[in-house]
């Protein structure tokens, strides 16, 4: 069974930037790719990027950077300021689409113990 | 304009065979998933058979696994659908259709239709 | 497979109703539905995607809601030539699966 993969990490040097990466771990090859904050697109979450391997990438502030790093893993950095900026304990969601399998979604947070002056 | 156009249809005995065709023009077809749906006589739509833009997946109804086949030219901008030991079951109206990414894979276009008739 | 259950088969009402069709999922298919229209004599045509959202030109007393197992379909201020079939679809996981339809007649 198909799985996706989501990993929130805040950055060492702005507190509160962050970056998201999702991974899926299935057979299928990847149709689109949507991240949103605030829990799934549509179930009150709203979209921060969404990424088509051909058609290419359209992305929404806070995000600064989304990007392919493999055919079936994306990264999005988040900016760190303004009034929407992200905090600690905000809900990043991956939704990859796959056809025609279908869709496959999980979400993921800052883990709790994460201190960012660690992770330089 | 988007236009999708069935073709191949008609009267055909029990056990026999028919090869459907769909042209699309109006949009790059090589970029779009496609598929056929059948509308039975009770008016119920099903999905017989679905093929990514990239030719590697596949997707078939379980009643037509085995009998029917999807294919595409990419060149020809044309979709088929290659059914064999047709059966009663297998009467309905058949469409052709495209799948838009951004859409969550929602049907955007249909064609007109063509009509199977298996007869004994 | 998912099974998209869709309530009422029927309805009858007068021009300037407001209409609702609902569509109950068998699990959970996220927010990845669409909604169709079949006028008489002719093929299904997309009105609605990820639930809520209008395909061009549809007009916006059409309206869509839900997420998970339970959405809803709207028609505001019904008209004349909103007679048709109705069909809700899953596209969360294969097979996509429609909805049994609901045929709408006006008084």
């Known amino acids: 069974t198909p799985e996706v993969w989501v990993q929130v990490r805040m950055e060492a040097t702005e507190l509160s930037s962050f970056t998201i990466r999702c991974g899926f771990l299935g057979s299928g090859s990847i149709s689109l790719v949507t991240v949103s904050w605030g829990g799934p697109n549509g179930a009150g979450g709203t979209t921060l990027a969404v990424l088509h391997p051909e058609r290419g990438i359209r992305q929404w502030a806070p995000a600064r950077q989304a990007r392919w790093e493999t055919q079936s893993s994306i990264s999005l950095i988040l900016e760190g300021s303004g009034a929407s900026s992200p905090c600690a304990n905000t809900t990043f969601c991956c939704k990859f689409a796959s056809f025609p399998e279908g869709s496959w979604e999980a979400c993921g947070s800052l883990p709790p113990s994460s201190d960012p002056g660690l992770s330089a | 304009d988007v236009k999708l156009v069935e073709s191949g249809g008609g009267l055909v005995k029990l056990g026999g065979s028919l090869k459907l065709s769909c042209a699309a023009s109006g949009f790059t077809f090589s970029s779009y998933h496609m598929s056929w749906v059948r509308q039975t006589p009770e008016k119920r739509l099903e999905l017989v058979a679905a093929?990514?833009?990239?030719?590697?997946?596949?997707y078939y109804l379980d009643t037509v696994k085995g009998r029917f086949t999807i294919s595409r030219d990419n060149a020809k901008n044309t979709l088929y659908l290659q059914m064999s030991s047709l059966k009663s079951e297998d009467t309905a109206l058949y469409y052709c259709a495209r799948h838009e990414d951004y859409y969550g894979f929602a049907m955007d276009y249909w064609g007109q239709g063509t009509s199977v008739t298996v007869s004994s | 497979s998912i099974v998209m259950t869709q309530t009422p088969k029927f309805l009858l009402v007068s021009a300037g109703d407001r209409v609702t069709i609902t569509c109950k999922a068998s699990q959970s298919v996220s927010n990845d539905v669409a909604w169709y229209q079949q006028k008489p004599g002719q093929s299904p045509k997309l009105l609605m995607y990820?639930?809520?959202n209008r395909f061009t030109g549809v007009p916006d007393r059409f309206t869509g809601s839900g997420y998970g197992t339970d959405f809803t379909f709207t028609i505001n201020t019904v008209q004349a030539e909103d007679l048709a079939v109705y069909f809700c679809?899953?596209?969360?996981?294969?097979?996509?699966?429609f909805g049994g339809g609901t045929k709408l007649e006006i008084k």
């Open positions: 990820y639930v809520s």
């Open positions: 093929i990514n833009s990239n030719v590697i997946s596949t």
């Open positions: 679809q899953q596209a969360y996981r294969s097979p996509w699966t």
